[in-house]
Interface confidence: medium
């Protein structure tokens, strides 16, 4: 499921460093929806893409996102054996050459056209949450997650135990 030995050897040597420029371990094409089953959709408007969170009509086709998985080290300044804190990171691309980016200054999630190697703002730590959901934590800003705010994706800071399991940062991935 995820793992190509050559890539593993490459990523295993990394510790507290960028993973950009490295080939993904595996890729997965899926539709992205919220905990409450609203779909994440992408629309081209005035030569740029907008991201929406909306209820689809019954037979409306869901937009797909290509998730590219990478394995990296949990950034750490602790003493260790160099393999402590392996984690999965993902990039999310709804269409060729465009990736979701975290804009930490504006607390927004945007679609940017860019070439590889991708910037760190395009990488999100994947958390395997309860109820078959996932959450996406910014690589560049630990504790900040992709979430839903006013029918748009936004960056939401999770700084207390009440916040994290709130539904607005939980997402479902589906092949259909």
């Amino acid at each position: 499921a995820f793992g190509i030995s050559g890539v593993q050897k490459y990523t295993r040597a990394l510790h507290d460093s960028s993973i950009t420029g490295i080939s993904p371990i595996t890729e997965y094409l899926a539709s992205l929806s919220t905990y409450n089953d609203q779909s994440i959709t992408f629309a081209l408007e005035d030569e740029s893409y907008e991201i929406y969170v909306e209820d689809l009509k019954k037979d409306e086709k869901k937009d797909k996102v290509l998730l590219s998985y990478y394995e990296s080290q949990h950034p750490s300044n602790e003493s260790g054996d160099g393999v402590d804190g392996k984690m999965l990171m993902v990039t999310l691309s709804p269409t060729k050459d465009f990736w979701l980016h975290a804009n930490n200054k504006e607390h927004s999630v945007e679609l940017h056209k860019c070439e590889k190697p991708l910037p760190d703002q395009a990488f999100f730590v994947l958390h395997n949450m309860h109820s078959n959901c996932v959450s996406f934590e910014c690589k560049t800003d630990p504790g900040v997650f992709i979430g839903v705010k006013d029918n748009h994706l936004a960056l939401i800071k999770v700084d207390s135990s009440e916040n994290l399991c709130t539904e607005n940062i939980l997402f479902k991935l589906s092949e259909t």
Epitope: A1, G3, K86, L164
Partner: antibody, heavy 122, light 111 residues
Framework: EVQLVESGGGLVQPGGSLRLSCATS????????MNWVRQAPGKGLEWVGF??????????EYSASVKGRFTISRDNSKSILYLQMNSLRAEDTAVYYC?????????????WGQGTLVTVSS | EIVLTQSPATLSLSPGERATLSCRAS??????????MNWYQQKPGQAPRLLIY???NQGSGIPARFSGSGSGTDFTLTISSLEPEDFAVYYC?????????FGGGTKVEIK
């Protein structure tokens, strides 16, 4: 270096209680889900439960066989994991291990303690 | 809960031979492109040792002779050429969902 050291095992009568400890070092304790896994003598491995990390509110999950009788807790100031076992039964006799995943709750465990033996017998 | 069935229960082989261990899940352990199936080795009196995680990834410091494959419900652990230290019990474990579950184990013994 990541270290996990269990203690607190021993002989206890059916219906009795026992508290196991898992002292940890070498990592930021609050960042990690922490698990208990047990193994009855000559038998296979059984997951007991886990306690989530700080960002997930330190909430817990248990296997059906121990739910309502066992409680997992943690002392984050001391980096110690606990397993409080009440209403013990003969079938709870096992070596109890604490285990830590690489990160988050992906659920695979490269780090294990040496185990502590709990014997429930009259 | 997801039930894992390992086969065979016992595998009698000689050093240098190839070992193929099977684990079958009662339902798929795949989720968002990852197979949440893991393999451990355990020797008497020792804690389990993670060999393979997410179906095919080697744990840290695990020799290259150990490999994992499979997806969905059927998984295989292969030891390409058995070394004397490989004779032990091997467990599969799913971590797709709580409760995490383990297979009953396969004992690899010297023929």
């Amino acid at each position: 270096e990541v270290q996990l050291v269990e203690s607190g095992g021993g002989l206890v009568q059916p219906g009795g209680s026992l508290r196991l400890s898992c002292a940890t070092s070498g990592f930021t304790f609050t960042d990690y889900y922490m698990n208990w896994v047990r193994q009855a003598p000559g038998k296979g491995l059984e997951w007991v439960g886990f306690i989530r990390n700080k960002v997930n509110g330190y909430t817990t999950e248990y296997s059906a066989s121990v739910k309502g009788r066992f409680t997992i807790s943690r002392d984050n100031s001391k980096s110690i994991l606990y397993l409080q076992m009440n209403s013990l039964r003969a079938e709870d006799t096992a070596v109890y291990y604490c285990a830590r995943p690489y990160y988050g709750n992906y659920g695979w465990f490269p780090y294990w303690g040496q185990g502590t033996l709990v014997t429930v017998s009259s | 809960e997801i039930v894992l069935t390992q086969s065979p229960a016992t595998l009698s082989l000689s050093p240098g031979e190839r070992a193929t261990l099977s684990c079958r899940a009662s339902e798929s352990v795949d989720n968002y492109g990852i197979s949440f199936m893991n393999w451990y080795q355990q020797k008497p009196g020792q804690a389990p040792r993670l060999l393979i995680y997410a179906a095919s990834n080697q744990g840290s410091g695990i020799p290259a002779r150990f490999s994992g494959s499979g997806s969905g419900t059927d998984f295989t652990l292969t030891i390409s050429s058995l070394e004397p230290e490989d004779f032990a019990v091997y467990y599969c474990q799913q971590s797709k969902e709580v409760p995490y579950t383990f297979g009953g184990g396969t004992k690899v013994e010297i023929k």
